[in-house]
């Protein structure tokens, strides 16, 4: 009876996500067979989040809308470890929008999910950000510094990275 109700709950939860994500990849969390964490297929997972590299080129606003439709946001990077994981899936000759912007042009950077912007946990390339007109952040590769952030014009199409919380069933 317990197993039956748990299965029913799982199925109803899966149905919620089905319109955006027809296929989920789930792994057992810990030793308890009852706890599964899932990411949409073919998203990648790291800690408690799922990540999707969008290779379509869009402006920052359209990229964020695109992530939103999938139940996600443009990526918010909270730690060096998280960035190190993300860059494993990026191409060196491409740039990718982050969920970081300065819409007022006053150097008040803000994350899309309202995570406080912490100057101590940022990975700007040296000399960046450097232009008040460039109000959106990308992550890209520079041979001298490897991967880091740069400010660019928001309307210039780039690839992007979406991030969502893992789905627990």
């Amino acid at each position: 009876n317990f197993m039956y109700s748990k299965t029913v709950k799982r199925l109803s939860k899966l149905r919620e996500y089905q319109q955006y994500h027809p296929s989920l990849t789930c792994v057992m969390e810990g030793k308890d067979i009852e706890d599964w964490s899932c990411c949409p297929t073919p998203w990648t997972s790291f800690q408690s989040s799922c990540y999707f590299i969008s290779t379509g080129m869009q402006s920052w606003t359209k990229s964020q809308k695109n992530c939103s439709v999938m139940g996600a946001d443009l990526v918010v990077i909270n730690t060096r470890e998280e960035q190190d994981f993300i860059i494993q899936n990026l191409k060196r000759n491409s740039s990718y929008f982050l969920g970081l912007s300065d819409p007022g042009g006053r150097r008040h950077w803000q994350w899309v999910d309202q995570t406080p912007y912490n100057e101590n946990v940022t990975f700007w390339h040296s000399g960046e950000p450097n232009n008040l007109d460039e109000r959106c952040a990308i992550i890209n590769f520079r041979s001298s510094e490897e991967w880091g952030w740069n400010d660019i014009h928001c309307h210039v199409p780039q690839k992007s990275i979406c991030k969502m919380k893992k789905i627990y069933i």
Epitope: T61, K62, D133, E134, I152, H155
Partner: antibody
Framework: EVQLLESGGGLVQPGGSLRLSCAAS????????MSWVRQAPGKGLEWVAT????????YYPDSVKGRFTISRDNSKNTLYLQMNSLRAEDTAVYYC??????????????WGQGTTVTVSS | DIVMTQSPDSLAVSLGERATINCKAS??????????VNWYQQKPGQPPKLLIY???NLESGVPDRFSGSGSGTDFTLTISSLQAEDVAVYYC?????????FGGGTKVEIK
Amino acid sequence: EVQLLESGGGLVQPGGSLRLSCAASGFTFSTYTMSWVRQAPGKGLEWVATINSGGDNTYYPDSVKGRFTISRDNSKNTLYLQMNSLRAEDTAVYYCATYRPYYYGSVLDYWGQGTTVTVSS
Amino acid sequence: DIVMTQSPDSLAVSLGERATINCKASQSVDYDGNSYVNWYQQKPGQPPKLLIYGASNLESGVPDRFSGSGSGTDFTLTISSLQAEDVAVYYCQQSDEDPWTFGGGTKVEIK
């Protein structure tokens, strides 16, 4: 008062090259993103190129990518547009304009009087 | 690319009467409560002049008989009381995503 003065237009044969200049005054040129916009005879407006204040980021539509190069010399307060492999359809009045950001978008708020480029054999 | 379609192509209005120009974007140009559409006026032999930005914000120095409205994909420029000096071609433009694109223009004349 903001002033933008384009020069360098003229008659050129198909396949030829031309360099347009835009002399800026009345504002701090080195802090402004700048753009070129063109208008074919009797037609509408078409964005051609944009360059950020430092000159390290440039953007073009597909119609001119690989043929046109936007650049700037902040010490001379001058914007340039190098146009190569010119075609008949590049015939237009070319305007330089200042770019002003508006949240995630932008406006082109000051425009020069334009310089005419004619591509014909 | 985002296509901006203006209507009508031309418009003849009596002095003092209202002129309305429409602009339709092929996809939404909104984000977070702002619309990334601008309107320009171009008089014969002159460069374009910015009138309205962000769909509804009047540029400094522009007479308040000009107004803009709309959101999403549908935008309107209104001249509440047409003056002789308003004879011009009017263009909408989106700045949400490169390439920036302009409408084909609407020619406003006096009837």
